[in-house]
């Protein structure tokens, strides 16, 4: 159905291809999380990262570039 399963960690890449839906699981999760591209209204939401949308919760989520962290990838990792 065009969905993919990836680990939703901050590895610098967005799960799946741009615009496609995807699912992620972590060892602690029982159920899959479904992601899609973020609405364009969030184009500036992730400061140093890429945005994905948690479909069930209707919330944006950031995958940070290396060296950044925080909800919006707004903080610099001084130890990186």
């Amino acid at each position: 159905d065009g969905n993919t399963t990836r680990t939703p960690e901050t590895n610098g890449s967005l799960c799946g291809a741009p615009g496609e839906n995807c699912t992620g699981t972590t060892p602690r999760q029982k159920s899959k999380t479904h992601f899609s591209r973020c609405p364009k209204q969030y184009k500036h939401y992730c400061i140093h990262g890429r945005c994905r949308f948690v479909m069930d919760e209707q919330t944006p989520s950031c995958i940070c570039e290396k060296g950044y962290f925080g909800a919006r990838c707004e903080q610099v990792d001084l130890f990186y």
Epitope: P39, Q41, Q58, P60
Partner: antibody, heavy 121, light 107 residues
Framework: QVQLVQSGAEVKKPGSSVKVSCKAS????????ISWVRQAPGQGLEWMGG????????VYAQKFQGRVTITADESTSTAYMELSSLRSEDTAVYYC??????????????WGQGTLVTVSS | DIQMTQSPSSLSASVGDRVTITCRAS??????LNWYQQKPGKAPKLLIY???NLQSGVPSRFSGSGSGTDFTLTISSLQPEDFATYYC?????????FGQGTKVEIK
């Protein structure tokens, strides 16, 4: 239960301004995006703009840019919409509407009762 | 701006009929689409969010489908209280835009 209560009907002269208020109760006011949507007599719905929580500021439709100001007073849980340089085509019912999201503007799950603004000389 | 086009603009139907309203976006909006019902003199009411999710308290005879540019609102068995005007709305990008509305009238 969330409630949005708007100020009463207004009659204004062309060229003047109007400020409509929207008082929220029953929810965490500052967490959600408040938008303003208008509806001219017999017409459809038109989004004017709204306050976006993650931005911490208002975003406006280009059509109203420079003529509308949307603000919020968290201490009184009240949102305001001020429209200036009024013309007859601004005669409409103005609604405040709360977004279902604490991030951006998504679905409007709660609406005010509407405020009729009549612009007439 | 993203243009939203609804069809038909009005329709006549009887109680018990299956009614379908379509909404087309001028560009792909994924599933970032909502449906509202509005009755005369009243504020709109949210029916469906994110294209296919039923808002709490809305009867299950309402359903939504679609993705990309083409979306559908279906009322499986029209009830007397369903005669109203229906609007779609996209929330992909600013400005938020609505369809022009579809008025469902009694045949």
């Amino acid at each position: 239960q969330v409630q949005l209560v708007q100020s009463g009907a207004e009659v204004k002269k062309p060229g003047s301004s109007v400020k409509v208020s929207c008082k929220a109760s029953g929810g965490t006011f500052s967490s959600y995006a408040i938008s303003w949507v208008r509806q001219a007599p017999g017409q459809g719905l038109e989004w004017m703009g709204g306050i976006v929580p993650w931005m911490g500021e208002a975003v406006y439709a280009q059509k109203f840019q420079g003529r509308v100001t949307i603000t919020a007073d968290e201490s009184t849980s009240t949102a305001y919409m001020e429209l200036s340089s009024l013309r007859s085509e601004d005669t409409a019912v103005y609604y405040c509407a709360r977004s279902s999201s604490t991030y951006g503007i998504h679905a409007f799950d709660y609406w005010g009762q509407g405020t009729l603004v009549t612009v007439s000389s | 701006d993203i243009q939203m086009t609804q069809s038909p603009s009005s329709l006549s139907a009887s109680v018990g009929d299956r009614v379908t309203i379509t909404c087309r976006a001028s560009q792909s909006i994924s599933n970032f689409l909502n449906w509202y019902q509005q009755k005369p003199g009243k504020a709109p009411k949210l029916l469906i969010y994110a294209a296919s999710n039923l808002q709490s308290g809305v009867p299950s005879r309402f359903s939504g489908s679609g993705s990309g540019t083409d979306f559908t609102l279906t009322i499986s068995s029209l009830q007397p209280e369903d005669f109203a005007t229906y609007y779609c709305q996209q929330y992909d990008d600013f400005p938020m835009t609505f369809g022009q509305g579809t008025k469902v009238e009694i045949k």
